[in-house]
Interface confidence: low
């Protein structure tokens, strides 16, 4: 019968001829009366056999990532008779892995959106690197992820590549962050290869800012000839939030005279002071009203940011008109 061990050849061997092993018949007594032959893909070009001894050699540099095993056939012939000594047999040469491939992030560019003020531990995104080396061969393809840039706001789970928030962030201070993740094979041991990727993390807005009046005191004038419904001026608050989180509603907090009203221009987010009833310079030529401003939409969990609406004082001077 045939006698051989499992055949392995390391990839990327630079020698012109590398002995892999021996293939022989147990009928071979070593007197050179048998001839060994190699057949199949790679026979003669990649692998050769010593016809007399059955020793097999690799004569080309191999790349496991291109081809990890070769299936060949062996024959042994009695030189005297020309007959097969053993039935033709199939055997396998496995290309063994070396760590010659760095981890690669295949899905980049990575981009994620996470709400500002998200608590620690909130999942942002998972990044995954691939390593073309053999995952079953030692640690060549065993990866560890680490954060090169993004502390203290982000952390990465070393074995999964899951990025999480590690510190609360305020969109109003910074609305996006670039995080750089490194993947290292050989679980970080010497000889490890690495690859990096960038992740753009954008913070989406939450309503964590209340509107605040630009001025603590506004001064407006109204002619005593102005009809009711006249817009006599505008007041404005600012809100550091964006979009619907910055939409606001103005209202009168205090107007003992009940002479004025405030409506909200939802396009400009301004408060428009409206004359509700006619004024008379001779009766009163100066009014003070207090206005307040609140956000339009405030989720229950964010009410803590919206206690005590911002207020402003509006001094309104009535302009005299000569009466006939």
């Amino acid at each position: 019968g045939w006698v051989w061990n499992q055949f392995f050849v390391p990839e990327e061997m630079n020698t012109t001829s590398h002995h892999i092993g021996q293939l022989r018949s147990d009928l071979d007594n070593g007197n050179n009366s048998f001839q060994y032959k190699l057949l199949g893909a790679g026979a003669g070009s990649t692998f050769i056999i010593d016809e007399r001894t059955g020793d097999i050699y690799a004569i080309q540099k191999l790349d496991r990532e291109e081809r990890s095993l070769y299936i060949l056939r062996a024959q042994v012939i009695d030189i005297a008779t020309g007959r097969a000594v053993e039935p033709e047999s199939e055997f396998v040469i496995k290309v063994s892995d070396i760590n010659d491939n760095e981890p690669k992030f295949l899905d980049e560019p990575y981009e994620a959106i996470v709400p500002e003020m998200s608590p620690e531990g909130t999942l942002v995104i998972q990044v995954t690197a691939s390593d073309a080396d053999d995952p079953s061969s030692g640690n060549n393809a065993r990866l560890l992820y680490s954060l090169l840039q993004g502390q203290p706001y982000f952390s990465v789970e070393p074995t999964t590549g899951v990025i999480r928030i590690s510190s609360k962030m305020d969109r109003e201070l910074q609305d996006e962050y670039w995080v750089i993740i490194q993947a290292k094979d050989m679980i970080g041991q010497p000889g490890a290869l690495s690859g990096t990727t960038s992740v753009l993390i954008k913070l989406s807005d939450v309503n964590d800012n209340k509107p605040i009046f630009k001025e603590s005191l506004y001064r407006l004038t109204v002619s005593e000839s102005a009809p009711t419904g006249t817009s006599i001026g505008t007041i404005m608050a600012y809100d550091n939030d964006i979009g619907e989180n910055a939409e606001m509603d103005y209202s009168i907090e205090e107007d003992d005279s009940q002479t004025f009203d405030i409506i909200t221009n939802h396009e400009t987010q301004e408060g428009i002071v409206i004359l509700k009833k006619k004024v008379d310079f001779e009766h009163q030529n100066h009014y003070g009203i207090r206005a307040k401003v609140k956000n339009h939409h405030v989720p229950e969990q964010l009410m803590k940011y919206h206690t005590e609406a911002s207020t402003t004082f509006i001094k309104i001077q009535v302009e005299d008109v000569d009466e006939p």
């Epitope: 207020t311 402003t312 001094k315 001077q317």
Partner: antibody, heavy 119, light 107 residues
């Protein structure tokens, strides 16, 4: 008649604090916005701060923002100016002034109190 | 802020003469929110004119104010001895600022 009397001025070292008072009489103090205005020696007038009639709103000149605090005690008919982190350039006569009820000009002024910031 | 520039810096006149003081604003003073004060040596300022042209209570009619937008004038028709003082304009259209003053002195 309307009277405004300032007090609390004096010589103070840079970085120190001082509180000025202005006692008001002869009018309904709680109905008027009140101001502090200063005048450096030989110089012009500089508006410093205003407080609304009810004390809920204050407004400051940029030169004193964050260092000075205007306040009022309606029960005592008194206006105050708390001056912290004083600098040499704060040296001046400090006047309290009443804002006209129907306007925003200053119709009554106190006689002033001198604050001298010097080491 | 609105900057007020007064001219001239000093006005040398005799009693009985007419004094014309100018105040120019760096931007339009809305609704003629401009006042004039005078200050005698060692005294507090005193309101003369508010709203650019309205005389304050107790102010003699020799004092008159005019102007709008960026140019304002205080006129003293006949100078009395007590009128020799420093005059300040003040805008209250946007916060409060004063001009640097015009000194009216006896010639």
């Amino acid at each position: 008649q309307v009277q405004l009397v300032e007090s609390g001025g004096g010589v103070v070292q840079p970085g120190r604090s001082l509180r000025l008072s202005c006692a008001a009489s002869g009018f309904t103090f709680s109905s008027y916005d009140m101001h502090w205005v200063r005048q450096a020696p030989g110089k012009g007038l500089e508006w410093v701060a205003v407080i609304s009639y009810d004390g809920t709103n204050e407004y400051y000149a940029d030169s004193v923002k964050g260092r000075f605090t205007i306040s009022r005690d309606t029960s005592k008919n008194t206006l105050y100016l708390q001056m912290n982190s004083l600098r040499a350039e704060d040296t001046a006569v400090y006047y309290c002034a009443r804002e006209r009820y129907f306007d925003w000009s200053f119709d009554y002024w106190g006689q002033g109190t001198l604050v001298s910031v010097s080491s | 802020e609105i900057v007020l520039t007064q001219s001239p810096g000093t006005l040398s006149l005799s009693p009985g003469e007419r004094a014309t003081l100018s105040c120019r604003a760096s931007q339009s003073v809305s609704n003629t929110y401009l006042a004039w004060y005078h200050q005698r040596p060692g005294q507090a300022p005193r309101l003369l004119i508010y709203g650019a042209s309205s005389r304050a209570a107790g102010i003699p009619d020799r004092f008159s104010g005019s102007g709008s937008g960026t140019d304002f004038t205080l006129t003293i028709s006949r100078l009395e001895p007590e009128d020799f003082a420093v005059y300040y304009c003040q805008q209250y259209s946007n916060s409060w600022t004063f001009g640097q003053g015009t000194k009216v002195e006896i010639k």
